[in-house]
């Protein structure tokens, strides 16, 4: 299973639920579906209040139990380590795959943390991070921001990922903006 890691803003905007949580248990495999679930302890929710309604406490995260079908395998054994998890809601359950944005909270830049906590949401409605994977790339719309990290650095951990958000400058126009300048 292969997928291009998304810009964190894309992960935020395309997810139903974005939370901070600790993985606290060994995965359990459902013997009917061959899906596995990890027990988690949620510490913060950044997106999904409306989608979840009253069931605002997520206790498990679900994923295919196999690598070949894009299952997520949690390798850290540190149960006190917090992770940013961006996933989809299916039947009220949080689902993730290999392609989901799951990262140790401590590995995120201060700018990314700020993005997840308050800024990425501003760009969700109007703006699109547009991956540039090979030259030449052209902006297809004024609301697109060209994401060149992977082209220039071969990594999703480039400057645009770690420090910038694609945000509205004026109606019909989005540009890369420093998350530092977004401090309230």
């Amino acid at each position: 299973c292969t997928c291009v890691p998304p810009h964190p803003q894309t992960a935020f905007c395309n997810s139903d639920l974005v939370i901070r949580a600790k993985f606290v248990g060994t995965p359990e495999v459902n013997q009917t579906t061959l899906y596995q679930r990890y027990e988690i302890k949620m510490t913060k929710m950044y997106k999904g209040f409306q989608a979840l309604g009253d069931a605002a406490d997520i206790r498990f995260v679900y994923t295919p139990a196999m690598e070949s079908v894009c299952g997520y395998f949690h390798r850290s054994h540190n149960r006190s380590e917090e992770f940013l998890i961006a996933g989809k809601l299916q039947d009220g359950l949080l689902h993730i795959t290999t392609c989901s944005f799951v990262a140790p909270w401590n590995s995120l830049s201060l700018a990314q943390r700020r993005g997840f906590t308050k800024t990425y949401t501003v760009g969700c409605e109007e703006c699109t991070v547009f991956p540039c994977l090979s030259i030449p790339c052209k902006l297809q719309s004024g609301t697109h921001c060209l994401w060149t990290d992977q082209l220039l650095q071969g990594s999703e951990k480039g400057f645009q990922s770690r420090h910038l958000a694609c945000l509205p400058r004026e109606p019909g126009l989005c540009t890369w903006q420093s998350l530092r300048s977004q401090i309230a």
């Epitope: 060994t26 995965p27 495999v29 013997q31 009917t32 579906t33 061959l34 139990a65 196999m66 690598e67 070949s68 079908v69 299952g71 395998f73 390798r75």
Partner: antibody, heavy 113, light 111 residues
Framework: QVQLVESGGGLVQPGGSLRLSCAAS????????MSWVRQAPGKGLEWVSA????????YYADSVKGRFTISRDNSKNTLYLQMNSLRAEDTAVYYC??????WGQGTLVTVSS | DIALTQPASVSGSPGQSITISCTGT?????????VSWYQQHPGKAPKLMIY???NRPSGVSNRFSGSKSGNTASLTISGLQAEDEADYYC??????????FGGGTKLTVLG
């Protein structure tokens, strides 16, 4: 109690086909993923294929991918393994197994000219 | 491909205890609590002795016990008896290959 009974084994020529069946009883068949495991003469155990309880998801070992097809009929409590393009190295006793515990007695498949 | 490592053979005298190890990785034995142990006598089907690391199916003697530490699972047989002589296989759920087995351990009961 849990019972799994395999059938359909036999002698087949290289390149031929065979369909194995496994009749299950003593448990709610549709509630369990099932798998096929094989054991070549004098050798260890090798996982072959698995299928989810609904039959919607199937998985195969690299050695049989593209040649074998696992399926199930939950209304008949039966698991199947369709084996095509058989090779000499597929010669083995084939066991039907419930995830992750009970096995049948096995059925012998011999691929030889 | 043998994914889990077991000793090829172990032996013990009647009444003794023996332990068979089964070493895997963090994506199989270490990552899940789904390790099973099977006993196989010549010409017979494997018989489930332990499932989910340490649980015994009804009808299996309490002389058989299972445990796990890190990436290694163990089967211990206490009060060894002549009928325990057989091949023993460990099996684990595996994130990469679905199900993986050990290569098998031949248990010989001496005397």
């Amino acid at each position: 109690q849990v019972q799994l009974v395999e059938s359909g084994g036999g002698l087949v020529q290289p390149g031929g086909s065979l369909r194995l069946s496994c009749a299950a009883s003593g448990f709610t068949f549709s509630s369990y993923a099932m798998s096929w495991v094989r054991q070549a003469p004098g050798k260890g155990l090798e996982w072959v294929s698995a299928i989810s309880g609904s039959g919607g998801s199937t998985y195969y070992a690299d050695s049989v991918k593209g040649r074998f097809t696992i399926s199930r009929d939950n209304s008949k409590n039966t698991l199947y393994l369709q084996m095509n393009s058989l090779r000499a190295e597929d010669t083995a006793v084939y066991y039907c197994a419930r995830f992750f515990d009970y096995w049948g007695q096995g059925t012998l498949v011999t691929v030889s000219s | 491909d043998i994914a889990l490592t077991q000793p090829a053979s172990v032996s013990g005298s009647p009444g003794q205890s023996i332990t068979i190890s089964c070493t895997g990785t963090s994506s199989d034995v270490g990552g899940y609590n789904y390790v099973s142990w099977y006993q196989q006598h010549p010409g017979k089907a494997p018989k489930l002795m332990i499932y989910d690391v340490s649980n015994r199916p009804s009808g299996v003697s309490n002389r058989f016990s299972g445990s796990k530490s890190g990436n290694t699972a163990s089967l211990t047989i206490s009060g060894l008896q002549a009928e325990d002589e057989a091949d023993y296989y460990c099996q684990s759920y595996d994130f990469i290959n679905v199900i993986v087995f050990g290569g098998g351990t031949k248990l010989t009961v001496l005397g």
